[in-house]
């Protein structure tokens, strides 16, 4: 993420641009893009960005719609950076278990787990 | 995920087993495991389960500690299933944009984005 714009501001601006250009983006009635069937979005970042690439190649560019896709590419870069940080530091078992407990706790309270 | 136990119950039981066996698991003082340096856990599932694999190979098995690792492998399978569902259905651009907006909205409100 560039030092020029914090990630949080980038996400906010991108949401606004997405709203602005929605009509232009949905112009292609025949295009089909893979859409995840659950709401655990972070698991699907690869597919989301592949979809954005498909959409970008189908969209008439210029002006702020170009900025929308540029922002999305910066968000992709940010997430790539976060993924790199997943395995960067080796720590004691104690600290790993804290993280695992936290992960399962989040899964328990925040994940959308469909009932079987 | 087996039909015998819902994923939510599995996660709850695993949290309890993790608490029970903590002392046994941290017995190896020299072992170092990669621990993510941020709290966007879903981005790091691969690294988390690699860490669990490392821990299991270093832990004396038997009794309910075996059940803990069995549960964790079922959770890994469940997450794998969720990841498969990321690109299963091709839908209209409209629906893709809804998902993208939702993803960015979640990023905006729930992600821990470090300030620069």
């Amino acid at each position: 993420i560039p030092t020029e714009i914090p990630a949080s501001a980038l996400v906010k601006e991108t949401l606004a641009l997405l709203s602005t250009h929605r009509t232009l983006l949905i112009a292609n009635e025949t295009l089909r893009i893979p859409v995840p069937v659950h709401k655990n979005h972070q698991l699907c970042t690869e597919e989301i960005f592949q979809g954005i690439g498909t959409l970008e190649s189908q969209t008439v560019q210029g002006g702020t719609v170009e900025r929308l896709f540029k922002n999305l590419s910066l968000i992709k870069k940010y997430i790539g950076g976060q993924k790199k940080k997943c395995g960067e530091e080796r720590r004691r078992v104690n600290q790993f278990l804290d993280y695992l407990q936290e992960f399962l706790g989040v899964m328990n309270t925040e994940w959308i787990i469909e009932s079987h | 995920i087996p039909t015998e136990i819902p994923a939510s119950a599995l996660v709850k039981e695993t949290l309890a087993l993790l608490s029970t066996h903590r002392t046994l698991l941290i017995a190896n003082e020299t072992l170092r495991i990669p621990v993510p340096v941020h709290k966007n856990h879903q981005l790091c599932t691969e690294e988390i389960f690699q860490g669990i694999g490392t821990l299991e190979s270093q832990t004396v098995q038997g009794g309910t500690v075996e059940r803990l690792f069995k549960n964790l492998s079922l959770i890994k399978k469940y997450i794998g299933g969720q990841k498969k569902k990321c690109g299963e259905e091709r839908r209209r651009v409209n629906q893709f944009l809804d998902y993208l907006q939702e993803f960015l909205g979640v990023m905006n409100t729930e992600w821990i984005i470090e300030s620069h």
Partner: antibody, heavy 120, light 107 residues
Framework: QVKLLQSGAALVKPGDSVKMSCKAS????????IHWVKQSHGKSLEWIGY????????NYNENFKRKATLTADKSSSTAYLEFSRVTSEDSAIYYC?????????????WGPGTMVTVSS | DIQMTQSPASLSASLGETVSIECLAS??????VAWYQQKSGRSPQLLVY???RLQDGVPSRFSGSGSGTRYFFKISGMQPEDEADYFC?????????FGSGTKLEIK
């Protein structure tokens, strides 16, 4: 393998128009955006603009907006650059290039270039 | 428009020597930089993109680094076939802009 084949050298009179082509092969033409770049003799590179063969959209460098027109023909996998009302300033080599990916605005493949000479 | 100031304009190096070229952007460009090699009478060839990613098939003696507004391109161990012009390009914003080039010759 990926290839971009450009039309041959052109000698043009001042005030005339010139149209050059860039034929793509070895990949799906509509999957990649084609950019055009100008290189004046012994000088650096100047971006003219791009054409999206899929959407038909284009974007121009302000400096070339009134001079260049970018088009493409999907059926023959060919992109075109047309220069109008040429002057001696337009004498240069013109390259087409393929953008590497939606989130990387660089060119992984270039055509061999078309040399344009403006002379009466 | 983003200006890309490239230096030096020309450079001569002995075989095996390490060579470095710098590009300074007029604003932060978030690592959106590519480096191209252009041999005499040929079209440019992509060597490095996204500041430090090596394009497929490019020898590992070529590398890129930098962040913010300052970016560097390095050849670790000059070879005879490296004699060429080198250009940087920013891909952060349109209009896309290039550096003025560095002519690299063998001493």
């Amino acid at each position: 393998q990926v290839k971009l084949l450009q039309s041959g050298a052109a000698l043009v009179k001042p005030g005339d128009s010139v149209k050059m082509s860039c034929k793509a092969s070895g990949y799906t033409f509509t999957d990649y955006i084609i950019h055009w770049v100008k290189q004046s003799h012994g000088k650096s590179l100047e971006w003219i603009g791009y054409f999206n063969p899929n959407s038909g959209g284009s974007n121009y460098n302000e400096n070339f907006k009134r001079k260049a027109t970018l088009t493409a023909d999907k059926s023959s996998s060919t992109a075109y650059l047309e220069f109008s009302r040429v002057t001696s300033e337009d004498s240069a080599i013109y390259y087409c290039g393929r953008r590497i990916a939606w989130d990387h605005w660089y060119f992984d493949f270039w055509g061999p270039g078309t040399m344009v000479t403006v002379s009466s | 428009d983003i200006q890309m100031t490239q230096s030096p304009a020309s450079l001569s190096a002995s075989l095996g020597e390490t060579v470095s070229i710098e590009c300074l952007a007029s604003e932060g460009i978030s690592n959106d930089v590519a480096w191209y090699q252009q041999k005499s009478g040929r079209s440019p060839q992509l060597l490095v993109y996204a500041a430090s990613r090596l394009q497929d098939g490019v020898p590992s003696r070529f590398s890129g680094s930098g962040s913010g507004t300052r970016y560097f391109f390095k050849i670790s161990g000059m070879q005879p076939e490296d004699e060429a012009d080198y250009f940087c390009q920013q891909g952060y914003k349109t209009p896309l802009t290039f550096g003025s080039g560095t002519k690299l010759e063998i001493k």
